[in-house]
Every structure is written in structure tokens, then in C-alpha cells.
């Protein structure tokens, strides 16, 4: 039985052409604004685009098993067609200016045509011949043709208005279309030649289809579906009236989907897409950014690419003229992506969602979604706000900063916590990037009024400030381990700078026409950055040969960018921390000589096996507990006394700032202010008696060290000056008497 199917914004309806069972709605839920429509007769399914939901959906003819097959990266998918032989779905998007293909279930999506497309609209396929045809509604409306893999594009009909309802008469080998600007229904041969006007007296023809000897069209002025003889335009009949804004129309019948090509047999033995082409019959195609292997059958995933995030999307981009530059990754439930990273070993994407305050991961195809760090830990009454993340691929750890707790945390890739490695009362670590090849991490510390860029070992020790001047809001960091360079973007100063990994050789790379840099990454010889305000991805050649280039424009709500380069497994395995985390229970560090050293997060200490971390021993209240090392407990008086008694120097870390009534020794030790310049060294480093400008009274003697004593105590055989200078030069023939 033949049916007329038509989409009318909120519903899709059918009319039997044989029994006149008129206008039955297919029971579909959630249709908002159905636009393009097609079917797969062997599966008894219909497919439609929804330009309000920005989805492509399918369901059986009885309305059952409704599912969205494409739900990402669509804007105005106003043209769509089913390749019934290759079991592929083609669509044209007037918003993204792309023609794309996927399997009928939405898998293996690829962009076929993206260059010089101006509002592609109607789309028709001829899979037995290997051609696709489409109309463009842009500045110069036309009808184009290409092979069904996107190659060999040519313009067939250049002199046409906004052509719609493009339809192929497969039996008579002719094209039909409506022209919205001239209100004509026209026809041509398959090369756009032998053009004929079929109807020229219609008020507003819009949708069109063909079946047997008739063409069927919708008229927006008459609010009707009508038919006429396909060659003469005569014998007109109104099929249905009182229909508003019918967007698309087609005839559901097996005769509209006949023929054969190699893709109809075992998918042409292709691993992903089988695409019909002229002469050659078919070619195997790959998902976007994948490459066809030498066997011309199977595909390999990309290993070198860029990832960039927007508020609610993560995109992949390749720098390849033959490939569509960027595609959206099908990852669900992205609310507010703040930062992204990638693990090239497991090929997993990691991101921070600042709406949900969590760190999540997934495969690039959206599968295996998993929450690595949850938004709150009720048992600890701890709220977190992850800000940035960086993966140590060797130890399999995520280093991440937190806006709520102002610490740097370490979490295993499977979500198990390692602990806090950096925490300080004044600290506000934000951007973070690890350099596990050298055992360091770099972070911006947005302390109020004194922002810094710092470096520390991966366990938080060996902390040093690299930069504290010439910074306002260093918002993003990037690192090139190969070149040994650190890069940062300052969103207040609107500039991008670089230095060596030690902080030397600081230079400004770019400071013009940068409005709101929010992300940086190094990719081959280029430094890429994203500018949120300019909605742009840009790059600068670090060799200085090619300068600055715009990569992509008009990308709203950009948040981060991250380069992925192919993982050299041989090099990877040579890293001493790559095998079982170097044997360490917690943090594995590479020493200068290439060997490993195990360390611990702040709340744990390294045990005697020098591999495992454990709870620190309990010291008495009169004692200070060293963070790590053999010596565990020291007298509390030795804390911040200017001398390191703990092996890990932790007794001299984060020393308090002295109060107003105290004097701070050079070592950081605090003493009573009254003891300053009293002639006795109360600071262990004796700095309280340095630079003392003391004038003694008339009845006092001034010791060599500046101390004042009573004049009568000079040369009295008692040592009163702490430097013994009161008893010097008194007795020409005898030593001063020993002190009582």
C-alpha cells in the first residue's frame, strides 16, 4: 500500500493513496517542529528532523520505538534523506552549512560537504548511481550534485530560485523541484539539462514528491496537498485541504526504494560506512576524523587532535584540509564545562562541570560515562568546586584545583582519592598543569593582591614562586615538555607570555587584540588559545616563522582547549612511574637521575619501606609531627625556629607571620619584641641582634656588640657583656677571671 507522509510542525501524518484513509496522525510524542522527512521501507520506519529540538529521530510507522538518532551538533537540519541501500542517513543543515552522513542509528557520523556551502536545504539521494543532489538557498541559489562520499561536487542548475522538495523520478531518470521564488514546479534530466516547467500557475508550492505517473506537492497559500501528471502538469487533484505549513511530503512505497549497489551486501565489507559512488560502485567511509586504513575497508581513530569545550559541548578538531575541521562529541548532560583533559592511553576524555561541581570522564563516542570526583562528600561535610585539572598519564592520576577548598587534590583516574598535595592559608591555586616527565606541577596562585605562578614537585614539596610581578589574573597555563617551555595567559593584562620551565627567559608572545583568553594548549609548533569574548580559536607559530592565525571563529561560550598528541608507547613505558606507579602507594616522583622517589599527600607520611604511605605517628602535644621521613616527632619549640629538624623540612613550612608585639627572625622564628637588640641573641640565627643602633647612657659602658652595661661593671673580673668585651684590655698580665 502506498501512503503519503507529511510533516506539519508538531505532527507527522499519513494519507493512504489507495483507500483514501485520510489524514491519520502517526502517534509520536515530543515532536516540536518536524521539518524534513524520509523513510526506510524495508524496516518500516520513518525518519524526521526537528528544527526546534535540533534532533533527527526515527520511529516505526505505528509510532513505536521512537528514538533520537542524532542529537548533537545540529542547528537547522532542514534536508534529510535515507540511503536505503547502504543503510545510511544523510542530512543538510542550513545553520551549520554542512552535509553529513551517519548510519541509520546515528553511529559513525561524518561530514561530507562543508566548504563553500551556503544554506543547503533539500536533499535527494540516488544510491544505485552513487550520487546525491541538494539545493542551496544562499546568496546564489542553485542545485548541486556530488558523489555520495562528498567528492566530485558540481553545480547542475545555477540559475534557479530557492529550490525545495528536490525529488528524483528513479524510473524516468529525472529531477523535480519547486521554486519558492518563481512559484514553479520544474524538472530536468539528471545533469540539470532538458529543463521543463511542469506547473507555473501555483500560488506557493513548497514540498514535492513523485510516485508513478504523478507528482504530489504542498501549497502554503492554498493550505493543500495536490497532485498532477508528472510530465504535463495536467489532471490536477486536491488530495487534502486545510493544512497549514506542511514542511515535507513523500510517498511511502517500496517502488521509491529499489535498485542495488555493493553497500546493500554486507555493508560492502566496510567496518563503518559504505558510501555509494559513481563508476567505482562504493567506497568505505570512516567516522569524522578517522582515517581509512590501507585495506580500504577498516578505519583508525585519530591519535593527534585538538579538543575544545563550550559551555555545554566538547568538540574535536583536526588540522587537515581533507577533513571537516571540527565535530561535536556525542556526550550527554554537559551543563557547564569549565576544563578538559584527555588520557591518550585509555582514550578517555575528562572534564570539569562547574554547574554540577564534578569531574567526569567518557569515551569520545559518549560511552562509558563515569563520575570521577563527586560534587560533595556528605560524610566529610565537604563541598567542592573543581576549577582545573591535569592528568599525570604515568601515575594515572588527576591533579585538580578546587575553588571551595583552595587546595590541589590528587585523585586516581578510577575516582579513588589520593589526597591533598598543596594547601596553604593564603593559597588560591587555580590553573594547574603537570609535567610528570620531570616530576613537577605548575599552577597559578590567585592570592588577593599578589597573584603568582608557582612550581612544586608533584607531592607539593620543593615549592617555588616562578613569577609574582607583571601578573594580574593568570588564568590559563600550558606546558611544552619537548621545548621546555611554560605558557600562560593573563585575562586582565590581555596577554600571553612564556618562559623556560625554571621561570627564566620570560617573554611576551602576544598582547594585541586579545580580549578574554581562557585556555591555552601546545599543538606541534603552535600555541593555540581561545578567546571567549571574541568567540575565537587562534594560534601562534612558536618558531616565529608564520605568526598568528585565526583557526575558527564564531564559537560561543568557549571554556577550554587541549591538544592531544599520539602516545609513543615505547617512550611511555620507559617512564619509571608508568609501571605500577613506580611501586609507590601514592605519589611517584622522578628524580634528576631518572630514578623514582615515592612520596605522600599531606595527611600521610612515608613509611620505612619508602614505598608506602601511612597515617603519621601520634606525637605528644608538646611535639610537632613531621609530614614524612624517619624523624617523626620534634619538640614544638623547634617548629619554625629557622633550623630544619624534620627530614622533609616540614617543621619550617608555612611558618606563621609574627604578631605586632613580636619580632620575626630572618629564619621566620618569632620572639618577644622586647628581646630585640637586648644584647643577647634570642633568635637562633642571632638576627635579633643585627643592625642594632643603640646609644648607651653616660654612666654605661657600650660593649663591642652594642650591649649596654653599668660603667662600674667594666673590668671587674666578671663577664657582663655577652661578647666578653667588658673584660678585655683590663689586665695586661692576666686572663679575666672565670665567671661565677
Amino acid at each position: 500500500e502506498a501512503f503519503l507522509l507529511f510533516s506539519r510542525r508538531a505532527d507527522i501524518r499519513r494519507i493512504s493513496l489507495e483507500t483514501n484513509n485520510n489524514n491519520v496522525a502517526i502517534p509520536l510524542t515530543g515532536v516540536k517542529e518536524a521539518s524534513a522527512l524520509d523513510f526506510d521501507v524495508t524496516d518500516n520506519r520513518i525518519y524526521w528532523t526537528d528544527i526546534s529540538l535540533k534532533t533527527i529521530s526515527r520511529a516505526f510507522m505505528n509510532g513505536s520505538a521512537l528514538e533520537h538518532v542524532v542529537e548533537f551538533g545540529l542547528d537547522y537540519p532542514e534536508g534529510m534523506a535515507v540511503d536505503w541501500l547502504g543503510k545510511n542517513l544523510y542530512w543538510a543543515d542550513t545553520g551549520t552549512n554542512r552535509i553529513e552522513v551517519s548510519k541509520l542509528d546515528g553511529q559513525h557520523r561524518q561530514v561530507l560537504v562543508w566548504k563553500d556551502l551556503d544554506s543547503p536545504r533539500a536533499l535527494a539521494l540516488d544510491p544505485a548511481e552513487g550520487f546525491m543532489y541538494w539545493t542551496e538557498w544562499g546568496g546564489k541559489p542553485k542545485i548541486d550534485r556530488a558523489a555520495m562520499d562528498g567528492s566530485e561536487r558540481t553545480t547542475l542548475v545555477p540559475n534557479v530560485g530557492r529550490a525545495n522538495g528536490l525529488t528524483i523520478d528513479y524510473a524516468k531518470r529525472r529531477l523535480y523541484w519547486t521554486d519558492l521564488d518563481t512559484n514553479l514546479i520544474e524538472s530536468s534530466n539528471m545533469l540539470g539539462l532538458n529543463r521543463e516547467v511542469i506547473a507555473d500557475d501555483l500560488p506557493h508550492p513548497f514540498g514535492l514528491t513523485q510516485y508513478q505517473d504523478y507528482i504530489y506537492w504542498t501549497d502554503w497559500s492554498r493550505r493543500s496537498i495536490e497532485r498532477a501528471n508528472k510530465t504535463s502538469g495536467q489532471n490536477r487533484t486536491i488530495i487534502q485541504g486545510h493544512l497549514d505549513y506542511v514542511m515535507d511530503i513523500l510517498v511511502f512505497h517500496s517502488s521509491r526504494q529499489s535498485g542495488w549497489n555493493e553497500c546493500a551486501s554486507s555493508n560492502g565489507h566496510c567496518s563503518h560506512l559504505c558510501l555509494a559512488v559513481p563508476v567505482g560502485g562504493f567506497v568505505c567511509g570512516c567516522p569524522a576524523h578517522y582515517s581509512l586504513n590501507a585495506d580500504n575497508r577498516t578505519c583508525s581513530a585519530p591519535t593527534t587532535f585538538l579538543l575544545f569545550s563550550q559551555k555545554s559541548a566538547i568538540n574535536r578538531m583536526v588540522i587537515d584540509e581533507q577533513q571537516s575541521p571540527d565535530i561535536i562529541l556525542p556526550i550527554h548532560s554537559l551543563r557547564n564545562v569549565r576544563a578538559i583533559d584527555y588520557d591518550p592511553l585509555d582514550k578517555q576524555l575528562y572534564w570539569i562541570d562547574s554547574r554540577q561541581n564534578m569531574i567526569r570522564k567518557a569515551q569520545e563516542d559518549g560511552s562509558q560515562g563515569f563520575t570521577v570526583v563527586v560534587s560533595s562528600v556528605p560524610s566529610q561535610n565537604l563541598e567542592i568546586q573543581p576549577y582545573d585539572l591535569s592528568i599525570d598519564i604515568y601515575s594515572r592520576y588527576i591533579y585538580w584545583t578546587c575553588e571551595a577548598t583552595n587546595v590541589i587534590n590528587v585523585t586516581r583516574l578510577d575516582g579513588r582519592s589520593v589526597g591533598v598535595v598543596l594547601k596553604g592559608e593564603q593559597d588560591r591555586p587555580r590553573a594547574v598543569v603537570v609535567n610528570p616527565e620531570k616530576g613537577y606541577m605548575y599552577f597559578t596562585n590567585l592570592q588577593e593582591r599578589s597573584p603568582k605562578i608557582e612550581r612544586a614537585a608533584l607531592d607539593g614539596t620543593e615549592r617555588e614562586v616562578l613569577f609574582f610581578s607583571g601578573l594580574s589574573k593568570p588564568i590559563a597555563l600550558a606546558l611544552d615538555s619537548r621545548l621546555g617551555k611554560l605558557f600562560w595567559a593573563d585575562s586582565d593584562l590581555r596577554r600571553i607570555e612564556s618562559s623556560d620551565l625554571s621561570g627564566a627567559n620570560r617573554i611576551v608572545l602576544e598582547d594585541s587584540n586579545i580580549l578574554q583568553p581562557v585556555g591555552l594548549t601546545v599543538f606541534e609548533n603552535w600555541l593555540y588559545w581561545i578567546d571567549k569574548q571574541q568567540q575565537m580559536i587562534e594560534k601562534i607559530d612558536m618558531t616565529g616563522r608564520e605568526g598568528r592565525t585565526k583557526v575558527q571563529a564564531r564559537i560561543a561560550q568557549l571554556s577550554d582547549i587541549h591538544a592531544v598528541k599520539e602516545l609513543n608507547l615505547q617512550e611511555y613505558r620507559q617512564h619509571p612511574c608508568a609501571q605500577d606507579n613506580g611501586g609507590c602507594s601514592h605519589i611517584c616522583l622522578v628524580k634528576g637521575d631518572g630514578t623514582t622517589r615515592c612520596s605522600c599527600p599531606m595527611h600521610l607520611v612515608l613509611l620505612q619501606d619508602e614505598l608506602s604511605c601511612g597515617e603519621p605517628p601520634t606525637c605528644s602535644p608538646q611535639q610537632f609531627t613531621c609530614f614524612t621521613g624517619e624523624i617523626d616527632c620534634i619538640p614544638v619549640a623547634w617548629r619554625c625556629d629557622g633550623f630544619t629538624e624534620c627530614e622533609d623540612h616540614s617543621d619550617e613550612l608555612n611558618c606563621p607571620v609574627c604578631s605586632e608585639s613580636q619580632f620575626q627572625c630572618a629564619s621566620g622564628q618569632c620572639i618577644d619584641g622586647a628581646l630585640r637588640c637586648n644584647g643577647d641573641a634570642n633568635c637562633q640565627d642571632k638576627s635579633d641582634e643585627k643592625n642594632c643602633e643603640v646609644l648607651c647612657l653616660i654612666d654605661q659602658f657600650r660593649c663591642a656588640n652594642g650591649q649596654c652595661i653599668g660603667k662600674h661593671k667594666k673590668c671587674d673580673h666578671n663577664v657582663d657583656c655577652s661578647d666578653k668585651s667588658d673584660e678585655l684590655d683590663c689586665y695586661p698580665t692576666e686572663e679575666p677571671a672565670p665567671q661565677a
Partner: antibody, heavy 120, light 108 residues
Framework: QVQLQESGGGLVQPGGSLRLSCAAS????????MSWVRQAPGKGLEWVSS????????SYADSVKGRFTISRDNAKNSLYLQMNSLRVDDTAVYYC?????????????WGRGTLVTVSS | SELTQDPAVSVALGQTVRITCQGD??????ASWYQQKPGQAPVVVIY???NRPSGIPDRFSGSSSGNSASLTITGAQAEDEADYYC????????????FGGGTKLTVL
């Protein structure tokens, strides 16, 4: 007017080479798939090779694969067939044919042919 | 995969004649029919389901069923005397065009 004109045929010894050309005029050559079809003396038609409009896709009959090369130059409206390692059984009239008005496999337009004779 | 035709068929002037073609590929693809007169290049007379190029008289028609295709000339004329070749794509999947062996039509 619409026409195809073959040239380049002639007598060649076995193992030798020839290059056939086909000049097209009167139609949009660059939109058509083009083919070579041959006919041995007193025999039927045999398809030899086809090339898509943009030269991306090429196909050969098993009997000539590896020996013949089809090519085209759309700027010159020309089709070519480079024939190497010629054999006696390659002796035939070689026709250039255009396909595309309706299908890649319906040859709408044929040239008059050029005779290739392979003989020692 | 091959296309098989009767080597020769004859028809009385003004009568109807049917030239047949058989082959597995015809289950998947439409046949096209070519007319070739002595010393001339072939000319397509029928393509697709039953399509005639412009300039081909309407006495020529095509039909197909299963693995068989037919060219029918209703009211054969003297000028129809020629060799007729059927052709289709090869369904083996190696992208070849196939020609039948040809049928010599004699108009008596």
C-alpha cells in the same frame, strides 16, 4: 554539435603501447562519466574502462587491468586510454562513450571509434 | 556474470518482434539496449525501466521480469535491421558494465 571523436589508433606490435584520445564537444564534458568500449572484428561490444566526472573513481575490465590506464582532462574536454603490453586479442575498434544524462551505466553518446590492430 | 542473447532474430516488415536478454545482473539492474548498424557506432534505444532517448521512435519499448529483459519493436521497419546489444551493470560487485553477445535482427 554534440560529438565525440576518437584518435590514436593504429598498428602496433604485441607488447607495444598506444595512447588513444577522445575529444568531446557540444556538451558539458566535465559532468559526464566517460568510458571506453571496444569491439573486436565481427564480435560483440566489450566494456573496457570507466572514469567518473572528476577522475576520482576508475574501473577496469579484468582483461585489461594493470595494462590500460584511463584518464581525462576536463579543461581540454578530453578522455585518454593509455594501452601498454598490448596483446593480439586487444585488436578492436575502440569507442569512447559518455554516460551521465540518466546513469553512469547508460552510454548516451558514442564516438565513431578508432581501430587498434595488434599484430606482429 | 554474463548476459545471454539469441544470436539472430528475424521479423516481417510491420510485425512485432521481441529480443530477449538473460542474466543474473538483471535481477538487480535495469537493462539498456543499443542498436548498431554496420560500420556505425552503437546508439542507445532504451535505458532504465523503459525510457527512450529523444529521437528514438516509440515503436521501441523495454520490459523486464526477474533475470530477463526484453526489447520489443512494434511494427518493425526496414531501418530497424541492425545488431542489438543489451547491457547492464555487473552484480558481482566489481563495478563492471556487461554487454550481451548481441542479436542480429533481420527485417524481411
Amino acid at each position: 554539435q554534440v560529438q565525440l571523436q576518437e584518435s590514436g589508433g593504429g598498428l602496433v606490435q604485441p607488447g607495444g603501447s598506444l595512447r588513444l584520445s577522445c575529444a568531446a564537444s557540444g556538451f558539458t564534458f566535465s559532468s559526464y562519466a566517460m568510458s571506453w568500449v571496444r569491439q573486436a572484428p565481427g564480435k560483440g561490444l566489450e566494456w573496457v574502462s570507466s572514469i567518473s566526472s572528476g577522475s576520482t573513481y576508475i574501473s577496469y575490465a579484468d582483461s585489461v587491468k594493470g595494462r590500460f590506464t584511463i584518464s581525462r582532462d576536463n579543461a581540454k574536454n578530453s578522455l585518454y586510454l593509455q594501452m601498454n603490453s598490448l596483446r593480439v586479442d586487444d585488436t578492436a575498434v575502440y569507442y569512447c562513450a559518455a554516460a551521465g544524462g540518466a546513469s553512469n551505466w547508460y552510454f548516451d553518446l558514442w564516438g565513431r571509434g578508432t581501430l587498434v590492430t595488434v599484430s606482429s | 556474470s554474463e548476459l545471454t542473447q539469441d544470436p539472430a532474430v528475424s521479423v516481417a516488415l510491420g510485425q512485432t518482434v521481441r529480443i530477449t536478454c538473460q542474466g543474473d545482473s538483471l535481477r538487480s539492474f535495469d537493462a539498456s539496449w543499443y542498436q548498431q548498424k554496420p560500420g556505425q557506432a552503437p546508439v542507445v534505444v532504451i535505458y532504465g525501466e523503459n525510457n527512450r532517448p529523444s529521437g528514438i521512435p516509440d515503436r521501441f519499448s523495454g520490459s523486464s521480469s526477474g533475470n530477463s529483459a526484453s526489447l520489443t519493436i512494434t511494427g518493425a521497419q526496414a531501418e530497424d535491421e541492425a545488431d542489438y546489444y543489451c547491457s547492464s551493470r555487473d552484480s558481482r560487485g566489481n563495478h563492471l558494465a556487461l554487454f550481451g553477445g548481441g542479436t542480429k535482427l533481420t527485417v524481411l
